[in-house]
């Protein structure tokens, strides 16, 4: 039985040209995290594999930085970066947990961080 939950930074906003940290945290499970994928809609941004380290998609390598931790830092933000981001945790023996973050990139300086909140986890077994 999968008992874990994914906590994310929730709905966040940032200024155009600035940076933002995408962060998820898996709790309430003793499962071992083997890999975390970061995706924007259906597009892969990065993979952090426990044994192999990071893979940053070549399309994003000039403005995506690994970390902190299993998180991801997006730099040189544009309004086109507005949208949904997903952290997909591959774990053993539980399976897959998915968290969602919504990022809004604003033209002005009114960007504020949303409060942290828990997203119900989606999971599937293989």
């Amino acid at each position: 039985m999968m008992t874990g939950t994914i906590e994310t930074t929730g709905n966040i906003s940032a200024e155009k040209g600035g940076s933002i940290i995408l962060q998820c945290h898996l709790s309430s499970t003793t499962a071992q995290v083997t890999q975390v994928n970061w995706e924007q809609q259906d597009q892969l941004l990065a993979i952090c594999n426990a044994d192999l380290g990071w893979h940053i998609s070549p399309s994003f390598k000039d403005r995506v930085a690994p970390g902190p931790g299993l998180g991801l830092t997006l730099q040189s933000l544009t309004v086109n970066d507005t949208g949904e981001y997903f952290c997909i945790y591959h774990t053993y023996p539980d399976g897959t947990y998915t968290g969602r973050i919504f990022l809004e990139v604003l033209e002005s300086s009114v960007a504020e961080h949303g409060a942290r909140f828990q997203i119900p986890h989606h999971h599937h077994h293989h």
Epitope: T34, Q35, L44, I47, N49, A50, D51, L52, G53, W54, H55, S57, P58, S59, K61, D62, H90, Y92, T96, H126
Partner: antibody, heavy 119, light 107 residues
Framework: EVQLVQSGAEVKKPGASVKVSCKAS????????MHWVRQAPGQGLEWMGR????????KYNEKFKSRVTITVDKLSSTAYMELSSLRSEDTAVYYC????????????WGQGTTVTVSS | DIVMTQSPDSLAVSLGERATINCRVS??????LAWYQQKPGQSPKLLVY???TLAEGVPDRFSGSGSGTDFTLTISSLQAEDVAVYYC?????????FGPGTKVDIK
């Protein structure tokens, strides 16, 4: 056109070291990780390690960790694989291979470099 | 280490017929599996990654399927140029490992 051009064949004595080069062209060298894979005569493929040309950070197969060093020269868009303390079982074709867009597989391969270890 | 096994070791198929190669993995690798083709005297060539995504420029007679621990590469209509050794590889952990290969010939 993506090209990975490797250095020529080498013959080495047991105990020596070999350094194989892989010159990349046709893409932005620092945007793609590079892998090294070897193939002994008539045998299958064996992964040795990978490197991020941008940061220089590398990961190795534990089997080779004490003997292999993977490096890059960003200026010349060249990756290198050095294997030390050679033995006859290291006789193989050594390939560099560019990591793909979506993970840790390899989408383009060099032509291979034959390394023969013989006394 | 993750152990990869392939079956059969070799197969001979008539031109235009279907060829099926299986790859079994010792543990769950989700869909992180690639297939490569290696012709005699040549470097490996990527055919499929993420179990079912065809690499750029690969003819659509090739297809991949499976997830978890069991995967299949299918050549729907074998052509003379498909004679080669085919390798599966997981791309999920260290070390990356390959199957022993399956040799495909014309019957």
């Amino acid at each position: 056109e993506v090209q990975l051009v490797q250095s020529g064949a080498e013959v080495k004595k047991p105990g020596a070291s070999v350094k194989v080069s892989c010159k990349a062209s046709g893409y932005t060298f620092t945007n793609y990780y590079m892998h090294w894979v070897r193939q002994a005569p008539g045998q299958g493929l064996e992964w040795m390690g990978r490197i991020d040309p941008d940061s220089g950070g590398s990961k190795y197969n534990e089997k080779f960790k004490s003997r292999v060093t993977i490096t890059v020269d960003k200026l010349s868009s060249t990756a290198y694989m050095e294997l030390s303390s050679l033995r006859s079982e290291d006789t193989a074709v050594y390939y560099c291979a560019r990591e793909g867009h979506y993970g840790f597989y390899s989408d383009y391969w060099g032509q291979g470099t034959t390394v023969t270890v013989s006394s | 280490d993750i152990v990869m096994t392939q079956s059969p070791d070799s197969l001979a198929v008539s031109l235009g017929e279907r060829a099926t190669i299986n790859c079994r993995v010792s543990e769950n690798i989700y869909s992180y599996l690639a297939w490569y083709q290696q012709k005699p005297g040549q470097s490996p060539k990527l055919l499929v990654y993420n179990a079912k995504t065809l690499a750029e420029g690969v003819p659509d007679r090739f297809s991949g399927s499976g997830s978890g621990t069991d995967f299949t590469l299918t050549i729907s209509s074998l052509q003379a140029e498909d004679v080669a050794v085919y390798y599966c590889q997981h791309h999920y952990g260290n070390p990356l490992t390959f199957g022993p290969g399956t040799k495909v010939d014309i019957k």
